[in-house]
């Protein structure tokens, strides 16, 4: 039978001294930028590992598929991307590890048709609210994305400007409305203490969102009930404790929701025992037979699917007066 | 050339149990979410359920009428898909596709390629 | 779940004549809808992906049209070797759910 998929096909690496001579002038159709391979038939771009500081400004108009990757890009400006004919068949972008620090408002802008975006691996320590909507509007035209790759993105201690660093990741995700139809969201390895209230019910379309390698110590104050068509939630490696019966029961009424809780210190005293009559009962864990407890000590790796609720109890608060210090 | 094949179909009775296989060629099998469909005699398609990829922790999901019944896996070692259908019941019968999605949700083209099918028939 | 209602379920056109088969989604799915042709004791075959776009290889008669709920697919002028039962599917949520099919046959 048929298919869409792209044959696949050898890359061209261009000549330097050929891209200079003709940089004056328009693009040519077929042309290949500097340090970069160029597959026409694949529309594929790669300039990968080549120490680049800008985007490359005669990127070929057939490109589908563009990778920047392992590069010194430091900043992307507003319209990073925009060229004249545009880039319109530009769906995947990868920038990842290219030691970016700054990404502007604007700077994705004309790119109609860019579904899937990977900005991992750069330590954004100033990302514009407006950098994916493109405009300070309350409401801006909606983004094509679909996908949004933001992992380890969390820029060092002293880079952090004194801001909240889930705060500005969270602002340039709600900024004019425009994702809304980003259908995956990867926040992995950003350090994240908390995760701000109102980010999940602004995004109506995630199918898949990963916070794993975070330091998230609680779900209280989250709240999943709009997310009706979550399909998997990432939680391992993270600083969970328990997961309390609002969240349990939020979990449980989405209809297709696979979440994976690996590697979290579940702390196994009396707040566990209704998260462990609900693992015993739920399909939507996958892994769920791995858990097991950190704390208290003597309760270290026990299995919470074998656990019951004789094995979960709380030392008595003592009085004031025969507690001792 | 991509390839789909199954095979582990057969007559089984109701209440058996029965393994069927997709073998995968001509494609970087790693990286597609795979499907299984099913086809009634003389009935329309019917999704079964998929499982996605490695990075996706090899996440499964199914319709709600083999919920609990079958489990699909995947050995991306051996370019292989499993469908492993427990407790059968008659409404099971039916030639069984195996499909391939692509693994992101930008993907265009939903299932693009299916292989042949492999009949399974479960009745006393 | 998204039901996927297709329409007609069966048709009967003549070599050259232009034939419509819609599928229409109880809520909106984008454009995430293919079209599949299936002929008896054959594998579903791809036709049209996103709703409108056409597979390489598929000849330029068939094409797809619709956002949303409502979609139609169209085969300009029948050829006989178009006899075949047609699907729809979405593949927006899950689970992804099929059109009834419509059989399409020569008068």
């Known amino acids: 039978s048929s298919s869409p998929t792209s044959s696949a096909s050898s890359f061209s690496s261009s000549a330097p001294f050929l891209a200079s001579a003709v940089s004056a002038q328009p693009p040519l159709p077929d042309q290949c930028p500097a340090l970069c391979e160029c597959s026409e038939a694949a529309r594929t771009v790669k300039c990968v590992n080549r120490n680049l500081t800008e985007v490359p400004t005669d990127l070929p108009a057939y490109v589908r598929n563009l990778f920047l990757t392992g590069n010194q890009l430091a900043v992307l400006p507003a319209g990073a991307f925009a060229r004249r004919p545009p880039l319109a068949e530009l769906a995947a972008l990868n920038l990842s590890g290219s030691r970016l620090d700054e990404v502007r408002a604007g700077a994705f802008e004309h790119l109609p048709s860019l579904r899937q975006l990977d900005l991992s691996h750069n330590p954004l320590a100033d990302l514009s609210p407006f950098a994916f909507s493109g405009s300070n509007a309350s409401v801006s035209a909606p983004s094509p994305l679909v996908e949004l790759i933001l992992n380890h993105i969390v820029p060092p201690e002293d880079e952090r400007q004194n801001r909240s660093f889930e705060g500005m990741v969270v602002a340039a995700l709600l900024a004019g409305r425009a994702l809304q139809g980003l259908r995956r969201l990867e926040l992995a390895s950003n350090h994240f203490l908390y995760l701000p209230r109102d980010v999940l019910a602004q995004l109506p379309s995630l199918r898949h969102l990963d916070l794993s390698n975070n330091s998230l110590v609680s779900l209280t104050y989250v709240s999943f009930r709009n997310l009706t068509h979550l399909e998997s939630l990432h939680l391992e490696d993270n600083a969970l404790k328990v997961l309390h019966n609002g969240t349990l029961a939020e979990l449980q009424g989405l209809p297709h929701i696979r979440v994976f809780l690996d590697n979290n210190p579940w702390v196994c005293d009396c707040h566990m025992a209704d998260m462990v009559t609900w693992l015993k009962e739920t399909e939507v864990v996958q892994g769920k037979d791995r858990l097991t407890c950190a704390y208290p000590e003597k309760m270290r790796n026990r299995v919470l699917l074998e656990l019951n609720s004789a094995d979960l109890d709380c030392d008595p608060i003592l009085p004031p007066s025969l507690q001792t210090s | 050339e991509v390839q789909l094949v199954e095979s582990g179909g057969g007559l089984v009775q109701p209440g058996g149990s029965l393994r069927l296989s997709c073998a995968a060629s001509g494609f970087t099998f790693s990286n597609y979410w795979m499907n299984w469909v099913r086809q009634a005699p003389g009935k329309g398609l019917e999704w079964v359920g998929e499982i996605r990829l490695k990075s996706d922790k090899y996440a499964t999901y199914y319709a709600e009428s083999v919920k609990g019944r079958f489990t699909i896996s995947r050995d991306d070692s051996k370019n292989s898909l499993y469908l492993q259908m427990n407790n059968l019941k008659t409404e099971d019968t039916g030639v069984y596709y195996c499909?391939?999605?692509?693994?992101?949700?930008?993907?265009?083209?939903?299932?693009?390629?299916w292989g042949q099918g492999t009949l399974v028939t479960v009745s006393s | 779940d998204i039901q996927m209602t297709q329409s007609p379920s069966s048709l009967s056109a003549s070599v050259g004549d232009r034939v419509t088969i819609t599928c229409k989604a109880s809520q909106d799915i984008n454009s995430y809808l293919s079209w599949f042709q299936q002929k008896p004791g054959k594998a579903p075959k791809i036709l049209i992906y996103?709703?409108?776009r056409l597979v390489d290889g598929v000849p330029s008669r068939f094409s797809g049209s619709g956002s949303g709920k409502d979609f139609t697919f169209t085969i300009s002028s029948l050829q006989p070797e178009d006899i075949a039962t047609y699907y729809c599917l979405q593949y927006d949520f899950l689970p992804l759910t099929f059109g009834g099919g419509t059989k399409v046959e020569i008068k």
């Open positions: 499909a391939r999605r692509r693994g992101y949700y930008g993907s265009a083209y939903g299932m693009d390629y």
């Open positions: 996103r709703a409108n």
